[in-house]
Amino acid sequence: IWELKKDVYVVELDWYPDAPGEMVVLTCDTPEEDGITWTLDQSSEVLGSGKTLTIQVKEFGDAGQYTCHKGGEVLSHSLLLLHKKEDGIWSTDILKDQKEPKNKTFLRCEAKNYSGRFTCWWLTTISTDLTFSVKSSRGSSDPQGVTCGAATLSAERVRGDNKEYEYSVECQEDSACPAAEESLPIEVMVDAVHKLKYENYTSSFFIRDIIKPDPPKNLQLKPLKNSRQVEVSWEYPDTWSTPHSYFSLTFCVQVQGKSKREKKDRVFTDKTSATVICRKNASISVRAQDRYYSSSWSEWASVPCS
Amino acid sequence: RNLPVATPDPGMFPCLHHSQNLLRAVSNMLQKARQTLEFYPCTSEEIDHEDITKDKTSTVEACLPLELTKNESCLNSRETSFITNGSCLASRKTSFMMALCLSSIYEDLKMYQVEFKTMNAKLLMDPKRQIFLDQNMLAVIDELMQALNFNSETVPQKSSLEEPDFYKTKIKLCILLHAFRIRAVTIDRVMSYLNAS
């Protein structure tokens, strides 16, 4: 058993049929010695008396808020949560496996630049009685500071018969140099509590590996005289690291109709303009990627050919 | 003061070209190592990230873009000093900081070159003959060093009398390639920045 926060404790249980469970001793936080009784949650049934209560925790029915009282007055609370371990593996029931970039990916993180600011998000089908707490650091043995905000519900989607909820959190490394060469990864730890179930999820990454620039901005077209060719120009996104001659981007320019199966014109360039062939009912799209370290491409920025 | 992209400073351009070749060569070599050594811990997640130049050179600090010198977090240690000549510099551009930066890059390349050559000598003794260093990568390191053209004492190639542990050597190769790729990215950024300045 260990303390998650004040008056909230996590009991780690091997979860299998007829498992013996864990013996837990609760101590009432009071100077009083006599006349103390214990109850669980909203029940008025007295579970025991005395300053300490010894319980065998085997299942969710044994978890919950234990309260010690004296003469009708509440002295203190202890909330017990369960953390299940099945076949040596901690349960991951609360969050959905996003399977990208690989299986067992519960947390996904992205950074728009090298400033040390990043966003992580996760998915769940659970809508109520759910809380998250996020901690982060650079390295684990001698951790350096990363400050994370509160996790918030950022999107709701309908997937078949189920509703899916996306939560996200923003974090900022306390003293980040955009030009630094990372040797210790960022560690992100998410504590998830659903009713009386506790789970924790972790992710470890270098900022350079989670870079995904914003789309290029200010796309403009200029038709070339006596030609089907069009010059398309754009600018670096505002959120990208500066100076741009140091933090350079490379671009992919594509002309395509509405369907992905349609024919297309595609060209890669390090410049902020390109010449392509425009077709009726097609769109010109441009996306960006770090020129020197190939992490993710940005989303497309698009303008219609016409 | 925008220089036209089509006419880069001839003094810096050869170094930019060589640094691009360097990044390409080390990335290809790393990819090859990851594929060939698939049953060894050779991915970024599996290896320890070591920097053999740590406390010996200060490339990131010495080559910091002016715009980032206002950032306190970027100014850990800018006290290392180096020799101040180099053929990548057009004389009108020569400044102490730039010479310091290019000299630091040269020292990095020299250290990695020695490590890679020592390692290759060991890998050539491996009866499995599983992996060797790409001669192109070694040649590209050499070309960039020549383009930088700094005078410095030659570092003797390390020779080891004991029987090499090929497993450890291959893991060390992965560690070295990952670190060198990160440094090659920095070098490329620096050359691009200097070329545009």
Epitope: R261, K263, K264, D265, R266, V267, F268, T269, I277, R279 | -
Partner: antibody, heavy 118, light 107 residues
Framework: QVQLVQSGAEVKKPGSSVKVSCKAS????????LHWSRQAPGQGLEWMGW????????EYAPKFQGRVTITADESTSTAYMELSSLRSEDTAVYYC???????????WGQGTLVTVSS | DIVMTQSPLSLPVTPGEPASISCRAS??????LHWYQQKPGQAPRQLIA???QSISGVPSRFSGSGSGTDFTLTISSLQPEDFATYYC?????????FGQGTKVEIK
Amino acid sequence: QVQLVQSGAEVKKPGSSVKVSCKASGGTFSDYYLHWSRQAPGQGLEWMGWIDPENGDTEYAPKFQGRVTITADESTSTAYMELSSLRSEDTAVYYCARNKELRYFDVWGQGTLVTVSS
Amino acid sequence: DIVMTQSPLSLPVTPGEPASISCRASQSISINLHWYQQKPGQAPRQLIAFASQSISGVPSRFSGSGSGTDFTLTISSLQPEDFATYYCQQSNSFPLTFGQGTKVEIK
């Protein structure tokens, strides 16, 4: 299985024209760009131009501009390349090629030898 | 027009050995570079798209690298069926242009 089948070899007199056909099978004809390139005996490849069969848009290499015409007939899934004012240096194997991507080629025809000789 | 220069023009290789062909562009073309193989009396066949993207159906011993002006096609271990002429082609701008070709011959 996508295939491009070209017309047979031709022998032409200098100053005349030649029209080579390229019939596509497998896949929708208008879903692809169609290109023509040529290869003189013992020489490398030389790109001549492309057509978008969907709308008839064409683009030609400046070297062939005014002398080459590329057309397409959607009803028969056939593209044509006509080269006029032939000279002996036009002797080459002419290839059609196609792709959903405009600027390179994933499927090629078998080639048509055009010999220009007096 | 962008001029593509291949080297060497002829490359004698022992079967089973690796081979590398270089292609250089007269100006920077990013990764807009494609590789083809052509055997005598046959049409070219696509090997690599955009400098390094492999094509389905092409053996994994063929790989491409490079960007900007310098590109390489590598065959990790030459098989008897790989003896052919190889062409690079730029798609950075029209007109599309090819290299002169590199003939890989049996040593």
